[in-house]
Interface confidence: medium
């Protein structure tokens, strides 16, 4: 009994620390990846970053964080499904072509990470409000940075 009772407090402490470490670490990695991707996306304008998407942030007062991530992923998926091979977006020059290809690649990565963070199967996107893709990504970046600051503090 003596040995067990002596071992329990440090064991409990270790488990608690391990749990916090794993949770914090997971949070950091996913968010860091998302923020990094968003930074890359917002750095570079392409022919189609001025196209409009559903603005899910306009009226998101009664929406949980997970729902927001899920709906953001849905909006991004709708965008790249529509415009991946849109010749207006692909442009005429090699540079425009590759910039658009890169945009789509980043949007797919972002979509994948947001779904992982949301952990939901589906979510409705019914808003009438629109914003440009560029503004949508900037807004998402602000939300993610806020979440990261809370997560890492």
């Amino acid at each position: 009994m003596g040995l067990t009772s002596q071992l329990l407090p440090p064991l409990f402490f270790l488990l608690a620390c391990a749990g916090n470490f794993v949770h914090g670490h997971k949070c950091d990695i996913t968010l860091q990846e998302i923020i990094k991707t968003l930074n890359s996306l917002t750095e570079q304008k392409t022919l189609c970053t001025e196209l409009t998407v559903t603005d899910i942030f306009a009226a998101s007062k009664n929406t949980t964080e997970k729902e927001t991530f899920c709906r953001a992923a849905t909006v991004l998926r709708q965008f790249y499904s529509h415009h991946e091979k849109d010749t207006r977006c692909l442009g005429a020059t090699a540079q425009q072509f590759h910039r658009h290809k890169q945009l789509i690649r980043f949007l797919k990565r972002l979509d994948r990470n947001l779904w992982g963070l949301a952990g939901l199967n589906s979510c409705p996107v019914k808003e009438a409000n629109q914003s440009t893709l560029e503004n949508f990504l900037e807004r998402l970046k602000t939300i993610m940075r806020e979440k990261y600051s809370k997560c890492s503090s």
Partner: nanobody
Framework: EVQLLESGGGLVQPGGSLRLSCAAS????????MAWVRQAPGKGLEWVSW????????YYADFVKGRFTISRDNSKNTLYLQMNSLRAEDTAVYYC?????????WGQGTLVTVSS
């Protein structure tokens, strides 16, 4: 050393067809997306078509959609461009390009002239 050698260009009448080939060497062809890019007299470079490494994904510029077909044979390290319903405005030097994030290697080009 990366080498891309285009062939198949020539003089053709409007409405005619040509098939361009590009023999690749000096890199693992099957690992790279490939593109056809062209330069018309006195104009800048414009991309024509792009194909991914396994040939399942293709892109076409608006001006060639439905007329040109890009394909590749990874066993022969060769890229193709089948050009149908050619128009005078398709007259250009056609280059094949190795593509990974940008078109980083080019061939010497093959001239396609569409004229009656």
């Amino acid at each position: 050393e990366v080498q891309l050698l285009e062939s198949g260009g020539g003089l053709v009448q409007p409405g005619g067809s040509l098939r361009l080939s590009c023999a690749a060497s000096g890199f693992t062809f099957r690992n790279y997306g490939m593109a056809w890019v062209r330069q018309a007299p006195g104009k800048g470079l414009e991309w024509v078509s792009w194909i991914n490494s396994n040939g399942r994904e293709t892109y076409y510029a608006d001006f060639v959609k439905g007329r040109f077909t890009i394909s590749r044979d990874n066993s022969k390290n060769t890229l193709y461009l089948q050009m149908n319903s050619l128009r005078a405005e398709d007259t250009a030097v056609y280059y094949c390009a190795k593509s990974l994030g940008r078109f980083d290697y080019w061939g010497q080009g093959t001239l396609v002239t569409v004229s009656s």
